[in-house]
Amino acid sequence: LRPSRVHNSEENTMRALTLKDILNGTFSYKTFFPNWISGQEYLHQSADNNIVLYNIETGQSYTILSNRTMKSVNASNYGLSPDRQFVYLESDYSKLWRYSYTATYYIYDLSNGEFVRGNELPRPIQYLCWSPVGSKLAYVYQNNIYLKQRPGDPPFQITFNGRENKIFNGIPDWVYEEEMLATKYALWWSPNGKFLAYAEFNDTDIPVIAYSYYGDEQYPRTINIPYPKAGAKNPVVRIFIIDTTYPAYVGPQEVPVPAMIASSDYYFSWLTWVTDERVCLQWLKRVQNVSVLSICDFREDWQTWDCPKTQEHIEESRTGWAGGFFVSTPVFSYDAISYYKIFSDKDGYKHIHYIKDTVENAIQITSGKWEAINIFRVTQDSLFYSSNEFEEYPGRRNIYRISIGSYPPSKKCVTCHLRKERCQYYTASFSDYAKYYALVCYGPGIPISTLHDGRTDQEIKILEENKELENALKNIQLPKEEIKKLEVDEITLWYKMILPPQFDRSKKYPLLIQVYGGPCSQSVRSVFAVNWISYLASKEGMVIALVDGRGTAFQGDKLLYAVYRKLGVYEVEDQITAVRKFIEMGFIDEKRIAIWGWSYGGYVSSLALASGTGLFKCGIAVAPVSSWEYYASVYTERFMGLPTKDDNLEHYKNSTVMARAEYFRNVDYLLIHGTADDNVHFQNSAQIAKALVNAQVDFQAMWYSDQNHGLSGLSTNHLYTHMTHFLKQCFSLSD
């Protein structure tokens, strides 16, 4: 729902976006994701911070935890035990990396309205979770895993070898957290809480990245992180399962690694419980084009886990790496052996397949020149998934239901026609057995969250419609947005163009390219955003374009895997090609073209500036990668192979920003990096700067002391203010 365009008579009451609007988050939106606790009940934190339980069927709601109780321990998060007897309250949140944080946990007993005293949890805890049934607790403290039968009981220590930066139990090390699991945890309860599976990561032999954290003391601290860069020694992973009822009986039992995986360096990629006595593990060769899914069963007689070769399913890519960004995870059906999984079909599009015995005999469930993106839920008779099929726009997401109980299976788009103009990009959240679900629409109009009946798909109520945001935007001159495509040499380049409110095709506008461009990413999406580039279009009259070139996702393997083993080539070429096409459109001032990007986008923007095309007047790189030898093994090697002579060292060397230092002579370059970036190390920008100095090339730079890859807090304001000044100066726009 975009505010409607106004007539000229009202135009003087409209104002442009300001940078202050963006930095203050004035036009941020809310989403509503129910915290499902049954088929028809969910928890939600109310505006006044009470934790409220809603029953959809009775229409009743009641407060299970008051804001007073929350405030008494300064709780910022909570978790209800499945038996509804206890709530954990989380406070003293302390961020570590992207997903990980430590916190203090208090357990509140709902039956007597008191905090559990005696055998309190230690602090700070690295991860804590309830069992799926009852109120057992598993937690990680000082890299070791502990179990509590009930919150008031003393803990049982499961692991003893945990050591900071050396051995991680139940939590991932840096590289597994960021590049493989994308979680803060590495432990998984079985469906009824009988077993607890966990990963142990041994980082003993991993080289350490060290950087200064300046703080306020006389001497800076040194932060040390075991961080495997491309080609370096990797973590050694082992998976164990322990019986939580009898944990000391045989202790943790290691799950065997498939022989074809164990023969060389490998990764563990995910674990999925099927039943209490069946578990599915996914493994990946270090050269990430072979993945093995292994289904293992508990052997009561030996108290061990058996993973027969007949239950090993191999997924191999011959044109690129296995999977998309990650290898997809299976969604098991009710027979507890067959499953649904997304992988490439024979035409090179990612689709849902049903695997009953072997991958070779998989039954393809979806097909077409589009991609299935996520399987949300499989019930006895339905499979819910998202795809970008509708109207052939890759940057959209709609939710579909396939009836699997009937033959042939029928397909229905649940969301395509609900709020067609407002909502083209959805995700969903399902209650138990998909009795109900919430739809969260991210745009292109103002986001809206709604509740639906899982059988009829009927909308029950609006959970969040962002009325205040809608009202606040009524007198704002928002830029216009259009999503279109360019056809170039058999490649389709989708782009999003953000145009000034009074855009006139007969005039010339400065162009800013915003680029990310990383493998399996997508920038051109039909989502709502009022952000920095909205301001640049609205107030500063710039045209901003985002282009999805080769290497980006959800348009088939040909586009996705085009960049395999040669990062930094086609992504850059496609941005340049798009710019040339935009110039041909007639409304771009070709003397005022800039490019900017962050992270992978900083790498692409740097290479584009140094391409020698003369297209770009200036550009900005925020926290860029400058050489793939400096980045994490798991990510880099997935797309580039190894930096060895007999593998791909030559392209590692050819694809650095430093190698192009000379080419920066004719552009204005602003290089920005946080000194405490744990992800893309400051080293990357330090090496660019060194190369530019050595080449006697002038450039501008800004560092952010003690800031990580996100440049958050006050740094954000400083960053965007600084970049705005730089662009306005580049485009000769008055301040």
Epitope: G134, Q149, P154, Q157, T245, Y246, A248
Partner: antibody, heavy 118, light 107 residues
Amino acid sequence: EVQLVESGGGLVQPGGSLRLSCAASGFTFRGYIMSWVRQAPGKGLEWVSWIGPEGSRTGYADSVKGRFTISRDNSKNTLYLQMNSLRAEDTAVYYCARLLYGTWFDYWGQGTLVTVSS
Amino acid sequence: DIQMTQSPSSLSASVGDRVTITCRASQSISSYLNWYQQKPGKAPKLLIYAASSLQSGVPSRFSGSGSGTDFTLTISSLQPEDFATYYCQQGTLLLPTFGQGTKVEIK
């Protein structure tokens, strides 16, 4: 407050039978392994038997295997020990105890005396 | 079965003394070793679990250490109420076994 109260002890002739009961309160009985431990007069402690939370899994000391049967009724929060073919050496105070994680006995009843004598 | 051997079988000590009782397992039991106190006519009471963890409500003068096969219970400063019999117990393989006990008497 956790409480375990044993009952059913007494004097029985060799070869006879006895059924001990243990009433539990103050905790979620159905979630824990429960156990019997005995102590002969003037002697040390000897573990007798344990039973899993659902009652499907049990364990016995060699000295009582085949003669004693442990059971539980989770709806009544009660633990039982059926003792058959009793011998003089079974004379002891029998304690009901919660066997946390199958590893340590964190709560004990006050005990009930079983005397096997003719 | 795993045998547990406690030493000494009895000891005499005065109030304020530091008392150490040892327990040896016939094979490695990791840290699955627990200590109990029993007074005449009463049920045993858990003092230390998992070799070194103090049970809730137990005074801090009691401490445990060790792993593998050799374990120690220490009372840092003996109090009048500490005169009792102490038992160690191993908790592996769902076959618990106790030591024969150590009687701590007033000197």
